[in-house]
C-alpha cells in the first residue's frame, strides 16, 4: 500500500469542505479496488468533525472510509466556529489505511483553517462583517456585533496582544451620511479608527436624510504595535455595508414553516407551506431569500435557472412553484439556514426543514412471539417488530390492522390497538392469551415511519412448560415405560393447580403409546392412547412401543412424538419428544425403564416363543432379564412376575 | 375523552329481538380495542355480554352466545347489540362501554 | 369461567375511614383486574386498571394492589361521594367476568 497526495486540507472556518485525491490518495502495487481500500479513523479532528455526505451529520463521529468515497467526494471536514476569535488554527487527523493483506498504512492528515484563504462561503477575512442598518436621517451604533476584526489580533501572542490593536484606515467615505468616533466626525485629513475604539461602542454612522440608497465604507484593516507601530501580520481590504431603510416601513413577518418532506434522489417544489412572509408594504419579487448555510441532503434549484443549486430567490419564486428542493442520495434530514429581507429592513433568520422520507420500509421479523404457557402471555420486543428503511427507524408507530384471534395486545396493562416502537423497545406491549384454546395465533400491523408505511404479520406460539428427556437411544422392539422421567409436566401441575394433560398429535412413525395393564389380573392388553394426563405418567400406566424401522435391516434411527400440553387456565402448547432408536443390544444398559424387549431376544436365550410381526413388540419379557439402569430392573421384575 | 350513548327501544315483548345501538363520540370505533355491552340485572352485578373489536371481530359471553350479535356501522361511528328470543330474565340495564368509559345505560322491560 | 368473587357484600364506614374491598379469582387472572365505582342509577366508573393504575382523574386515595388470585381496592380516606357500589372485573380470560359487587354504606 502506498499514500500519495498532499496530506493536508485548507478549510475557511466554519465551513464544510470534502476530502480529495489531490488530499488523500492510496493506491496498491495489486491495483485494489478502491471500495477495498479502507481508511480508519485512529483519532479524530478536536476543531471539527469528519462525515459522510450521504449519512446522518449529526450523529456518531465516522469510524471508517474507502478511497472510493473520497474520490466520491463524499467525505467532509466540518470546521465548528469557536466562541473565541482565531486567525490560523491546526487540526490533525490521524487514520490508518489497510487492504489485507498488505501491511496497515498509518497517515496523518493535516487541516488549517484560516482567515487568510480565500472563502467563497464568507466573502470577508474578518471574524465579523455584517453591514449596518440605519433609519433614513438617523444615526446609529457600529458595534463589534456588525464589525469585529478580533481574528487578526489573535495571530499575535497572547502576551502580546494587550499591547496592539488593529487599525482600520477608510479608503472610501460614505457618501450619504458620516462616520463619527467619539463624535467626530472622519474625513480625509483624518481616515482611522481602531478595534478598541469600535469595542468600546464609540463609532457612529450618522445618515444624512433624503432617500433610501445604499451607503457604506471601503477600508483597509492590519495589526498596530505599540506606540501605533506598523507590524508585520495579516492585514485585508473590504467594504463595509450600510442599507438605508424607510422610517414607515413594517419589517416583513415570517410564518410558520412546514418542514418539505421528499424521498431521497427526487425533487420537490418549495411551497408557501415552507417559506413565506406577511409584508403589507412589499410585492412578493421584493422579499429576497439568501442561502447562508445548505444541508447536505441536496440543494435548491430555479426552474428556468440553472441546474445547479441557488443561493438567492424570492417569495414570487417561492409563489409561482419555480423554486424547488433537489434531493441528493442522502438520507439525513437537513436545515436550510437563510436570510430573509424586503431590501428595506434589516435581514431576518429563517430555516427550512428538510425531511427525507425512506422510499419505502420494511418491518424486519426476526422470530416469533414465544409465550410462555404457565404466564400466558409475553413482551414484544424488537425481534418481533422493528423497522428499517435506509436506516433504523426508532420512531415508527405501529397500529393493529388485524387482532389476534386467541388474545389481545395490551401497553401499560390496558388493550391497545395502536403502539410506538419506544413502547416495544420499553417491553411495554405485551401479548396476552385471552382464549386458551390454541397454542397459536397472529397479528398484523401496519407500521408507519416518515411518511411510509408496510405491514407484517407477528407469529405467536406458546413454549411448553414441559421436561423432556434427552438421552441416549431407546432399543427398537421393546416397550419402554413413559414417566416423568420422560416426560413431566409437574412444573405446570404446580403452575396451575391442575392436571395437566397430553394429547398426542403426531408420531412415532415406528411405534405407538399404549396404556399397559398393572398386573396379569387386568383384563386384555396393551391399549393404544391418544390422550393422557401427568397423573398417568406418575403411575407408570403408559409404555412407548419402539417400532422397527419397515423393510430394512435393523439400523439406528430417529423417531419422534408430537404432543400438545394442556392446564387449566393456560394455553396449550405444542411440543415434541425425539428420541433415537437402534437395534435392542441386551449387553447395554438403558436408561429408561424396559416393560418388554423384542421376541428375537428371548429366542436367542433359549426361551422359544411364538414370534410376533417385525416392529410389533412381543409379550412381557421373562426371562432372561436385561440390564435396566435407575430402579428399571425392579421395575421390569415387578412387571414379569407372574409370565 | 370519549363518550358513549345507547339509544333503542325500552320496552320489548317477549320472544322477539332487542335492539339497542351506541353512538361514539371523542374517538373512533376502528381505533379503541374493544366495544363491549354489559347489562346489569334489576338489584344485581354486571354481565358481561360481548364485544365487537377495532378490526371487527367478536366474542361473546357463551351463556348468550346463540343469541346475540354485535355490528357495527364505522361510517356512522356506531356498534349495535342484537339480542333474539327475549324473556323476562333479560329485562336489565344494557350499558355499552369500552375499556374505560361506559355510556349512562338504557332500562329495557321484556313484557307483554 | 372465572368466577370472581367479592368481599364483604356490604360494609358500613364513616368519614375518614380505610376501607379495604377484596376480591378472588378462580384462578390466576395475571394481574388483568378492573376496579369500578357505581352509585345508583349511574354506569360504572373505572377506578383502577391492571391491579393497580390509577385511571385519570381518579383522586389518590384509591388504590389497587394484589397478584394471582387475590386483589384488593383500598380507599385511604373515605370521602362523603365515596359511598357507592364497587365492582371488580377481570379481563384475562373470556368471558370477562364481574364480581358480584361491595356496597360501601354510611355508618
Known amino acids: 500500500l502506498s499514500l500519495e497526495g498532499s496530506r493536508t486540507l485548507t478549510v475557511c472556518p466554519g465551513s464544510v469542505q470534502p476530502l480529495s485525491s489531490q488530499t488523500l490518495r492510496a493506491s496498491s502495487s495489486a491495483g485494489t479496488d478502491p471500495q477495498l481500500l479502507l481508511y480508519r479513523v485512529v483519532r479524530g479532528p478536536q476543531l471539527g468533525r469528519l462525515f459522510h455526505a450521504q449519512q446522518d451529520s449529526t450523529g456518531e463521529a465516522l469510524v471508517n472510509f474507502t478511497q472510493a468515497e473520497v474520490y466520491a467526494g463524499n467525505i467532509l471536514y466540518e470546521h465548528e466556529m469557536p466562541t473565541e476569535p482565531f486567525w490560523e488554527a491546526h487540526d490533525t487527523l490521524e487514520l490508518q489505511l489497510s487492504s489485507p493483506p498488505a501491511r496497515d498504512v498509518a497517515a496523518t492528515l493535516a487541516v488549517a483553517v484560516s482567515f487568510e484563504a480565500a472563502c467563497p462561503q464568507r466573502p470577508s477575512h474578518l471574524w465579523k462583517n455584517k453591514g449596518l442598518w440605519v433609519p433614513e436621517g438617523q444615526r446609529a451604533k457600529i458595534t463589534m456585533a456588525a464589525l469585529d476584526a478580533s481574528n487578526l489580533l489573535a495571530s499575535v501572542p497572547s502576551p502580546q496582544r494587550l499591547e496592539h490593536d488593529v487599525l482600520f484606515q477608510v479608503t472610501q467615505f460614505p457618501s450619504r451620511g458620516q462616520l463619527l468616533v467619539s463624535e467626530e466626525p472622519l474625513h480625509a485629513g483624518q481616515p482611522h479608527f481602531l478595534q478598541s475604539q469600535l469595542a468600546a461602542g464609540q463609532l457612529v454612522y450618522a445618515h444624512g436624510g433624503g432617500g433610501t440608497q445604499q451607503d457604506g465604507f471601503h477600508f483597509r484593516a492590519h495589526l498596530q504595535g505599540p506606540a501605533g507601530a506598523t507590524v508585520a501580520g495579516p492585514q485585508t481590504s473590504e467594504a463595509f455595508a450600510i442599507t438605508v431603510r424607510d422610517v414607515n416601513e413594517r419589517p416583513p413577518q415570517p410564518q410558520a414553516s412546514v418542514p418539505l418532506r421528499i424521498t431521497r434522489g427526487s425533487r420537490a417544489p418549495i411551497s408557501r407551506a415552507q417559506l413565506s412572509v406577511v409584508d403589507p408594504d412589499s410585492a412578493p419579487g421584493e422579499i429576497e431569500y439568501e442561502v447562508q448555510r445548505a444541508p447536505h441532503n441536496g440543494f435548491l434549484s430555479l426552474v428556468g435557472g440553472g441546474p445547479g443549486p441557488v443561493t438567492h430567490f424570492t417569495q414570487a419564486d417561492v409563489d409561482s412553484g419555480r423554486l424547488a428542493f433537489v434531493a441528493n442520495g442522502s438520507s439525513v434530514a437537513g436545515v436550510f439556514q437563510l436570510s430573509m429581507s424586503d431590501g428595506a429592513s434589516p435581514p431576518l433568520p429563517m430555516s427550512l426543514a428538510v425531511d427525507i422520507l425512506p422510499s419505502a420500509i420494511e418491518v424486519q421479523l426476526q422470530a416469533p412471539l414465544e409465550v410462555p404457557q404457565a404466564l400466558g402471555r409475553s413482551s414484544l420486543s424488537q425481534q418481533q417488530l422493528r423497522v428499517v428503511s435506509d436506516r433504523e427507524e426508532p420512531e415508527a408507530a405501529y397500529r393493529l390492522i388485524q387482532g389476534p384471534k386467541y388474545g389481545h395486545l395490551l401497553v401499560g396493562g390496558r388493550p391497545a390497538s395502536a403502539f410506538s416502537q419506544l413502547q416495544i423497545d420499553q417491553g411495554e406491549v405485551v401479548f396476552a392469551f385471552t382464549n386458551f384454546s390454541s397454542s397459536h395465533d397472529h397479528f398484523r400491523v401496519l407500521a408507519l415511519a416518515r411518511g411510509v408505511n408496510a405491514s407484517a404479520v407477528v407469529n405467536i406460539t406458546v413454549r411448553a412448560l414441559l421436561h423432556v428427556w434427552a438421552g441416549g437411544p431407546w432399543p427398537q422392539g421393546a416397550t419402554l415405560r413413559l414417566d416423568p422421567t420422560i416426560l413431566d409436566a409437574g412444573e405446570l401441575a404446580n403452575r396451575t393447580g391442575s392436571v395437566p394433560h397430553f394429547r398426542l398429535l403426531e408420531g412415532p412413525r415406528h411405534g405407538r403409546v399404549v396404556r399397559v395393564p398393572r398386573a396379569r389380573t387386568e383384563p386384555g392388553g396393551s391399549q393404544l392412547v391418544e390422550q393422557f394426563t401427568q397423573q398417568d405418567l406418575e403411575d407408570g400406566r403408559l409404555g412407548l412401543e419402539v417400532g422397527r424401522p419397515e423393510g430394512r435391516a435393523p439400523s439406528p434411527t430417529g423417531d419422534s412424538l408430537t404432543l400438545e400440553l394442556w392446564a387449566q387456565g393456560v394455553p396449550p402448547a405444542v411440543a415434541s419428544l425425539d428420541f433415537a432408536t437402534e437395534p435392542y443390544n441386551a449387553a447395554r444398559p438403558y436408561s429408561v425403564a424396559l416393560l418388554s424387549v423384542p421376541e428375537a431376544t428371548r429366542m436367542e436365550a433359549g426361551k422359544p416363543e411364538s414370534s410376533t410381526p417385525t416392529g410389533e413388540p412381543g409379550p412381557m419379557a421373562s426371562s432372561p432379564v436385561p440390564a435396566v439402569a435407575k430402579g428399571g430392573f425392579l421395575g421390569f421384575l415387578e412387571a414379569n412376575m407372574f409370565s | 375523552q370519549v363518550q358513549l350513548q345507547e339509544s333503542g327501544p325500552g320496552l320489548v315483548k317477549p320472544s322477539q329481538t332487542l335492539s339497542l345501538t351506541c353512538t361514539v363520540s371523542g374517538g373512533s370505533i376502528t381505533s379503541g380495542y374493544y366495544w363491549n355491552w354489559i347489562r346489569q340485572h334489576p338489584g344485581k352485578g354486571l354481565e358481561w355480554i360481548g364485544y365487537?373489536?377495532?378490526?371487527?371481530?367478536?366474542n361473546y359471553n357463551p351463556s348468550l352466545k346463540s343469541r346475540v350479535t354485535i355490528s357495527r356501522d364505522t361510517s356512522k361511528n356506531q356498534f349495535s347489540l342484537k339480542l333474539s328470543s327475549v324473556t323476562a330474565a333479560d329485562t336489565a340495564v344494557y350499558y355499552c362501554a369500552d375499556f374505560d368509559y361506559w355510556g349512562q345505560g338504557t332500562l329495557v322491560t321484556v313484557s307483554s | 369461567d372465572i368466577q370472581m368473587t367479592q368481599s364483604p357484600s356490604s360494609l358500613s364506614a364513616s368519614v375518614g375511614d380505610r376501607v379495604t374491598i377484596t376480591c378472588r379469582a378462580s384462578y390466576g387472572i395475571r394481574g388483568y383486574l378492573n376496579w369500578y365505582q357505581q352509585k345508583p342509577g349511574k354506569a360504572p366508573k373505572l377506578l383502577i386498571y391492571y391491579t393497580s393504575s390509577l385511571h385519570s382523574g381518579v383522586p389518590s386515595r384509591f388504590s389497587g394492589s394484589g397478584s394471582g388470585t387475590d386483589f384488593t381496592l383500598t380507599i385511604s380516606s373515605l370521602q362523603p361521594e365515596d359511598f357507592a357500589t364497587y365492582h371488580c372485573q377481570q379481563y384475562s380470560a373470556l368471558p370477562w367476568t364481574f364480581g358480584q359487587g361491595t356496597k360501601v354504606e354510611i355508618k
Open positions: 365487537i373489536t377495532y378490526d371487527g371481530s367478536n
